[in-house]
């Protein structure tokens, strides 16, 4: 038996694709959603972080360290940041 395979090209409209990963905006607290090859990514406003911007708080990305302070930690949702302050400055934000 010979099996004949017919290859068809079909133009798929957006309606046929179903909901995209950003449909309904999974990002909380005013975060903006962008689609990635496998899922989605939220860009969070200052003061929020986490996969869906659901966690309230400041991270190193917010630039919390003043007067030349170096921000250590704060890279993942469970860790708080610490500012290492240059000589002559102190306080949690080297202020």
């Amino acid at each position: 038996d010979h099996h004949h395979h017919h290859h068809e090209q079909k133009l798929i409209s957006e309606e046929d694709l179903g909901p995209g990963p950003c449909d309904g905006n999974p990002c909380a607290n005013g975060g903006s959603c962008s689609e990635t090859p496998r899922s989605f990514e939220c860009t969070c406003p200052r003061g929020f972080y986490g996969l869906r911007c659901e966690v309230s708080g400041v991270t190193c990305a917010d630039g919390p360290c003043f007067n030349g302070g170096l921000c250590v930690g704060g890279a993942d949702p469970d860790s708080a940041y610490i500012c290492h302050c240059p000589p002559g400055f102190q306080g949690s934000n080297c202020e």
Epitope: C60, A61, D62, G63, P64, C65, F66, N67, G68, G69, L70, C71, V72, G73, H84, P86, P87, G88
Partner: antibody
Framework: QVHLQESGPGLVKPSETLSLTCTVS????????WSWIRQTPGKGLDWIGY???????NYNPSLKSRVTISLDMSNNQFSLKLSSVTAADTAIYYC????????????WGQGTLVTVSS | EIVLTQSPGTLSLSPGERATLSCRAS???????LAWYQQKPGQAPRLLIY???SRATGIPDRFSGSGSGTDFTLTISRLEPEDFAVYYC?????????FGQGTRLEIK
């Protein structure tokens, strides 16, 4: 003006510990943060870590499990220990002081080449 | 970590010309905590600029830095023979401290 001078063996065997000392003159070791940086032809400049007399210490995560930086206040020196070395740790090692207005490097030693080889 | 990408890799110019070196960060560098260094063969790097635009002690005013966020520039207004070297940028806003891969400035 701060002057820095590295010293230590130029050849270390694989799996052993690299030990370097930086002697500081022209400034008190309690006045600055002190850092180590290394340079390889392939990877360029790599920050290793820093330490402050008050206890603030910070290491590059890529080396953290193998690095110790310590201060010797009485001799105005600070040191680097890097354990379990491999050929990838062959580099020029620099000691440096960190600026008073931020974590940039304002004074550097001349550098010392450390080769890891059996 | 913040990745710094410098361009061009090599810049060929003549003495007296203007040099423009770029440093681009993978994410915004807080408060413009960026430094520039010059390195000559067999020597340690030398601090030129910190805070994106402040000249270090003893650095001639032909060197200037600018930029904020993710894009930073080092400009040498009129190249002197001693300016031909490798230049590195470094960010110190977020740990780990990172450096760019360098731009080689060579005589044309």
């Amino acid at each position: 003006q701060v002057h820095l001078q590295e010293s230590g063996p130029g050849l270390v065997k694989p799996s052993e510990t690299l030990s370097l000392t930086c002697t500081v003159s022209g400034g008190s070791i309690s006045s600055y943060y002190w850092s180590w940086i290394r340079q390889t032809p392939g990877k360029g400049l790599d920050w290793i870590g820093y330490r402050y007399y008050s206890g603030n210490t910070n290491y590059n995560p890529s080396l953290k499990s193998r690095v110790t930086i310590s201060l010797d206040m009485s001799n105005n020196q600070f040191s680097l220990k890097l354990s379990s070395v491999t050929a990838a740790d062959t580099a020029i090692y620099y000691c440096a002081s960190i600026g008073v207005a931020g974590f940039y490097f304002d004074y550097w030693g001349q550098g010392t080449l450390v080769t890891v080889s059996s | 970590e913040i990745v710094l990408t410098q361009s061009p890799g090599t810049l060929s110019l003549s003495p007296g010309e203007r040099a423009t070196l770029s440093c681009r960060a993978s994410q915004s560098i807080s408060r413009s905590y960026l430094a520039w260094y010059q390195q000559k063969p067999g020597q340690a790097p030398r601090l030129l600029i910190y805070g994106a635009s402040s000249r270090a002690t003893g650095i001639p005013d032909r060197f200037s830095g600018s930029g904020s966020g993710t894009d930073f520039t080092l400009t040498i207004s009129r190249l002197e023979p001693e300016d031909f070297a490798v230049y590195y940028c470094q960010q110190y806003g977020t740990s780990p401290i990172t450096f760019g891969q360098g731009t080689r400035l060579e005589i044309k």
